[in-house]
């Protein structure tokens, strides 16, 4: 049995939501990925939940009678999601910390969006990408 | 042209985001988008920072003068990034609105946990994947 | 850089009048008004654009208040009539970094000290 699944039921418990009408009016999360096979869609979803995750740990950081249990789960969290990937985890949250009010922050967003744009569809990644696409148009 | 660029420009102007300086100390996505080539990597990426620009324009609704261009910017992102899939699009936004501070989220995220981390890593999604890699395992 | 600085406020009786001043140092577009009652949140009053030809009000000042502004002077009044007690509270003037035109307080990013508006009955 993987660590995180007795510290998540630690967490239940801390937060009384181990009561099936916790489960009333609908999942947050389980419906909503169970919409999407595909990988990088899913992606798309969980990149979203993980930092929902995190951003909630964050606010009960202080309290000690939970922090083994976070701290366990957010290391599982590490391992499956960015591959035990240092990199990648300090990317994402590097994205997650930007403020939204800050004005440089603003600007420079403003300043990257068309870059950022042209780079949103797969077929934009490459050019070779986009060069095997024409060849399979006739 | 695609038609972002053009309402693009215009947002530059209205954020005073067309200097030269406004690239100074480095760049918010730019750089983390050039570490990442592998397509399920970028979207975690990208889902972080899609929802940044989808925050920031919801800040500046209310003001009728960029209206245009920003929802020019986001019909363009819808077809980018989402596909034109309303069901992706919708989903990804339940997601960026659930409040952290709500206790009945929180609770429902908690009760979720679980199976949440089940499903994060790609080779959890389907059993057929797990068993196919035990194979190569010899 | 933008800096704001408010004067005019203090204390006047029920349907009295008072009129604060904003200077403003550096480009403003906008510029706003907002004010913060004891124990309540920091709320709109009023904005006015850089031309001066078009404002917006909170609908409890619509009628009673009007911003102004003077581009010689860099200046932004807002002249307040028809006092209630409702109306004390703290009184800042805020500006945009960027050309936003509207009331929501997240987008203003230079802020006054503030000027004190205490209305008695």
């Known amino acids: 049995q993987d660590p995180y699944v007795k510290e998540a039921e630690n967490l239940k418990k801390y937060f009384n939501a181990g009561h099936s009408d916790v489960a009333d009016n609908g999942t947050l999360f389980l419906g909503i990925l169970k919409n999407w096979k595909e990988e990088s869609d899913r992606k798309i979803m969980q990149s979203q939940i993980v930092s929902f995750y995190f951003k909630l740990f964050k606010n009960f950081k202080d309290d000690q009678s939970i922090q083994k249990s976070v701290e366990t789960i957010k290391e599982d969290m590490n391992v499956k999601f960015f591959n035990s990937n240092k990199k990648k985890r300090d990317d994402f949250e590097k994205l997650t910390n930007y403020s939204v009010t800050d004005l440089n922050v603003q600007r420079k967003a403003i300043h990257e969006l068309i870059q950022v744009m042209a780079e949103l569809s797969p077929a934009a990644k490459t050019g070779k990408r986009k060069r095997s696409q024409m060849l399979f148009r006739g | 042209q695609d038609p972002y660029v053009k309402e693009a420009e215009n947002l530059k102007k209205y954020f005073n985001a067309g200097h030269s300086d406004v690239a100074d100390n480095g760049t918010l996505f730019l750089g983390i988008l050039k570490n990442w080539k592998e397509e399920s990597d970028r979207k975690i990426m990208q889902s972080q920072i899609v929802s940044f620009y989808f925050k920031l324009f919801k800040n500046f609704k209310d003001d009728q003068s960029i209206q245009k261009s920003v929802e020019t910017i986001k019909e363009d992102m819808n077809v980018k990034f989402f596909n034109s899939n309303k069901k992706k699009r919708d989903d990804f936004e339940k997601l960026t609105n659930y409040s952290v501070t709500d206790l009945n989220v929180q609770r429902k995220a908690i009760h979720e946990l679980i199976q949440v981390m089940a499903e994060l890593s790609p080779a959890a999604k389907t059993g057929k994947r797990k068993r196919s890699q035990m194979l190569f395992r010899g | 850089q933008v800096k704001l600085e408010e004067s005019g406020g203090g204390l006047v009786q029920a349907g009295g009048s008072l009129r604060l001043s904003c200077a403003a140092s550096?480009?403003?577009?906008?510029v706003g008004w907002f004010r913060q009652a004891p124990g309540k949140e920091r709320e709109f009053v009023a904005a006015i654009s850089w031309s001066g030809g078009s404002a917006l009000y909170a609908d409890s000042v619509k009628g009673r208040f009007t911003i102004s502004r003077d581009n010689a002077k860099n200046t932004v009044y807002l002249q307040m009539g028809s006092l209630e007690p409702e109306d004390t509270a703290y009184y800042s003037c805020?500006?945009?970094?960027?050309?936003?035109?509207?009331?929501?307080?997240?987008?203003?990013?230079?802020w006054g000290q503030g000027t004190q508006v205490t209305v008695s009955s």
């Open positions: 550096g480009l403003t577009y906008t």
């Open positions: 805020a500006a945009p970094g960027t050309r936003y035109y509207g009331s929501n307080q997240v987008n203003y990013n230079y």
